[in-house]
């Protein structure tokens, strides 16, 4: 969580603030979901480890025409230190496992909440 400053704000943003904004956006997506998210599009599952922000973006960037996750894609790009384009894959992808975007978002949300708690209390 060391490279989160300066994202989604005019000035430098403390890492916890940036992480909190991303979590809030994922909460909004899960709560406001009526029809299947992104028409049930499938994405590569990722390992939720150190480089997961770039890996998450690499997975989600391959979903096009889904306005519900556009803000999340933009936010993740602020968390990832390098440029990510469609078709790019890192070693963090579980390349034999695809899951629905809705499940991907839920898994990511749970993990980010855990990271947020750890950051608060440690």
């Amino acid at each position: 969580l060391t490279c989160l400053g300066g994202f989604a704000s005019p000035g430098p943003v403390p890492p916890s603030t940036a992480l909190r904004e991303l979590i809030e956006e994922l909460v909004n997506i899960t709560q406001n979901q009526k029809a299947p998210l992104c028409n049930g599009s499938m994405v590569w599952s990722i390992n939720l480890t150190a480089g997961m922000y770039c890996a998450a973006l690499e997975s989600l960037i391959n979903v096009s025409g889904c306005s519900a996750i556009e803000k999340t894609q933009r936010m993740l790009s602020g968390f990832c230190p390098h440029k990510v384009s469609a078709g790019q894959f890192s070693s963090l992808h579980v390349r034999d496992t695809k899951i629905e975007v809705a499940q991907f978002v839920k898994d990511l949300l749970l993990h980010l909440k855990k990271l947020f708690r750890e950051g608060q209390f440690n």
Partner: antibody, heavy 120, light 107 residues
Framework: EVQLVQSGAEVKKPGATVKISCKVS????????MHWVQQAPGKGLEWMGG????????ASNQKFKGRVTITADKSTDTAYMELSSLRSEDTAVYYC?????FGGGPFAYWGQGTLVTVSS | DIQMTQSPSSLSASVGDRVTITCKAS??????LSWFQQKPGKAPKSLIY???RLVDGVPSRFSGSGSGQDYTLTISSLDPEDFATYYC?????????FGGGTKVEIK
Amino acid sequence: EVQLVQSGAEVKKPGATVKISCKVSGYTFTDYEMHWVQQAPGKGLEWMGGIDPETGGTASNQKFKGRVTITADKSTDTAYMELSSLRSEDTAVYYCTSGDYFGGGPFAYWGQGTLVTVSS
Amino acid sequence: DIQMTQSPSSLSASVGDRVTITCKASQDINSYLSWFQQKPGKAPKSLIYRANRLVDGVPSRFSGSGSGQDYTLTISSLDPEDFATYYCLQYDEFPYTFGGGTKVEIK
């Protein structure tokens, strides 16, 4: 149904230590942060500190000058708050409270309270 | 530490009245604010979180608003069971801090 059940009332002498328990049911213990709140007779609410039950990491209010120790036992889904060097001003009801920071707030659920009386 | 200034400290109202309680933070708390109701001898009960989101099961006559440093709890039409003490809480940063409370009494 979420329940936070606290241990019973305590009477302590000045200088002693009290340890209160808070047993959780109805949700996964490690999913939510747990906090402790003090309420002196006829007074308002004061945050004492909190813990991430997953990691055991804590945060506490400097007002209590290191007298507060908060712990969590994942094997029993129970949180504990220990207050040492008790003085008469510590006579109060102590509440445990927890919740999802992003879905209801960190103080969504409350225990019934534990009255601690400090008297010589 | 962030100070939470709650006003009024007490008020008298009648059943059916519209009641407004305010909390002012000493700095921007990014809408990380909750409201609680407490009755004598009971634990506080959560009403509102994130400044304006109603907790499940809480009557719709309760509403929260505000942003930045200024927040409001409104009871649109006071019910007999609403006579109690109300507290705000900021959870934007540690140490979390409560307002001093507002006692709503029967006129």
